[in-house]
């Protein structure tokens, strides 16, 4: 190797200056006694190199780039060799930003997968490899005192969510949870959440059905629908409140919300609808009165209201 570049820092804040030095060894016999060292950033030649011979006979060129405005570029030092440029050495320069504080950290407890799923917004692009780690600990109180640490949760590349498995959770006990972002320019941490996994539980929705007509029950009135639903069995013992939404299948009507439904009701007569009209209906539930997240809306049930009973008065048409 005839030449060697060293830089003040290979990774800097975008727009910051960078200083580099290129040293050419004396024993490079094919070189001129006083070679002129050239600098190139990417494909562009860079003026301003200050060259000197050192006491050991080596040549050194120092350059200061006042603003590194490329997020990634190669800086090379070279010599004119015949009609071509002979590259002596090159280094990769990176520029970007330290990670912003991750924000909007939120979690939900999925009882089916038995895991606490947390997600966050990473903030603006840093232009640098940035790692995110979901960090947590168990706490007996309100997270002021830290108990056992929980194994770090590292999301897959590019993802802004991570799942803490059941074996690291303690239900009905608070956990401190935060996200740490780190790159070559710094580290930042989100505000800490303090939560009991059960306080962010997200239930699965019930399954809506049409109510089986029983011989003794009166048929639904015009503009009414008789509904029943099967609760999500694994959440059966969790007190919850539910709500329905419905809209006519045809037309551009928006959803109409009905709720909260009577607690523990597993059936409901929905009235005030248009007669002889097909409706789409869905139901969702939330742990209540204790805190939790709304379930997703259930798969749709499609039902038709009965016709209005025929009336016997006459319509007179006036011409």
């Amino acid at each position: 190797e005839c030449g060697h570049i060293s830089v003040s820092a290979p990774i800097v804040h975008l727009g910051d200056p960078i200083t580099a030095s290129c040293i050419i060894k004396q024993n490079c016999s094919h070189l001129d006694p006083e070679p002129q060292i050239l600098w190139r950033l990417g494909a562009e030649l860079q003026p301003g190199g200050r060259q000197q011979r050192l006491s050991d006979g080596t040549q050194e060129s120092i350059i200061t780039l006042p603003h590194l405005n490329h997020t990634q570029a190669f800086l090379s030092c070279a010599l004119n060799w015949g009609n071509s440029l002979q590259i002596l050495d090159q280094v990769e320069l990176r520029a970007g930003y330290p990670p912003a504080i991750p924000h909007n950290l939120s979690c939900l407890m999925n009882l089916t997968t038995s895991s606490l799923i947390c997600q966050w917004e990473p903030g603006p692009e840093t232009h640098l490899p940035t790692s995110f780690t979901l960090k947590s600990f168990k706490s007996r109180g309100n997270c002021q005192t830290q108990g056992d640490s929980i194994l770090d949760c590292v999301p897959k590349d590019g993802q802004s969510h991570c799942s803490i498995p059941r074996k690291h959770l303690l239900l009905y006990q608070n956990m401190g949870i935060w996200v740490q972002a780190e790159n070559a320019l710094g580290t930042s941490m989100s505000p800490q959440l303090c939560l009991d996994p059960m306080a962010v539980v997200k239930l699965e929705p019930p399954m809506l059905r049409t109510m089986d007509p029983s011989p003794e029950a009166a048929p639904p009135q015009a503009g009414c629908l008789q509904l029943s639903w099967e609760p999500w069995q694994p959440g059966l013992h969790i007190n919850q409140k539910c709500e329905l939404r419905h809209k006519p299948q045809r037309g551009e009507a928006s959803w109409a919300l009905v709720g909260p439904l009577p607690l523990e009701a597993l059936q409901y007569e929905l009235c005030g609808l248009l007669p002889a009209t097909a409706y789409t209906l869905q139901i969702r539930c939330i742990r209540w009165p204790l805190p939790g997240h709304w379930s997703d809306w259930s798969p749709s049930l499609e039902l038709r209201t009965t016709e209005r009973a025929p009336t016997h008065h006459h319509h007179h048409h006036h011409h």
């Epitope: 009882l111 997968t113 038995s114 069995q233 059966l236 013992h237 523990e264 009701a265 597993l266």
Partner: antibody, heavy 118, light 107 residues
Framework: EVQLLESGGGLVQPGGSLRLSCAAS????????MGWVRQAPGKGLEWVSS????????PYADSVKGRFTISRDNSKNTLYLQMNSLRAEDTAVYYC???????????WGQGTLVTVSS | DIQMTQSPSSLSASVGDRVTITCRAS??????LNWYQQKPGKAPKLLIY???NLQNGVPSRFSGSGSGTDFTLTISSLQPEDFATYYC?????????FGGGTKVEIK
Amino acid sequence: EVQLLESGGGLVQPGGSLRLSCAASGFTFSLYWMGWVRQAPGKGLEWVSSISSSGGVTPYADSVKGRFTISRDNSKNTLYLQMNSLRAEDTAVYYCAKLGELGWFDPWGQGTLVTVSS
Amino acid sequence: DIQMTQSPSSLSASVGDRVTITCRASQGISSYLNWYQQKPGKAPKLLIYYASNLQNGVPSRFSGSGSGTDFTLTISSLQPEDFATYYCQQSYSTPLTFGGGTKVEIK
């Protein structure tokens, strides 16, 4: 301290009836599911029935369906099990228990013995 | 109905032994598995809920693991007061069902 105290057990003839009670204290009774679990002499545990916090949902074991009725009086903090058409195989210690949100039983009462015999 | 099969039905062990009891569900029950200890003439006592959560006041030598269909209760170092019968129970769906029990006796 959470306490559950069963009463009403005793000797009854086949075909007879009995009503068990469970008095609860030390927690907000009206917020919790409650249940009955029985244990025949020298045997394992068998779930009998549960009741939701307001009493609207009452699942039963097939072995007692149509014969037993679970109910509760939240104003008296009391759980009941009305047992009709009793059979010899209903002989057991009957425990009342508070149900956790994910379906575990804790705590349990001390149990009351029901003996069905002629 | 979901059947719960416990094994072994009984075992003999000495104080200080590591004891493992298994419970298998006839279908997947996620983590809805609870463990109880019962001593003669006494009501059962909850040890572990939701497969691995230690109930308050239960010694840390008790631990639970598993998910889906296969679950384990482990006593890391058996103490004299641990000789009892242990039951698993699924709470994934009604009817709620118990395993047949495992009696832990002194060797």
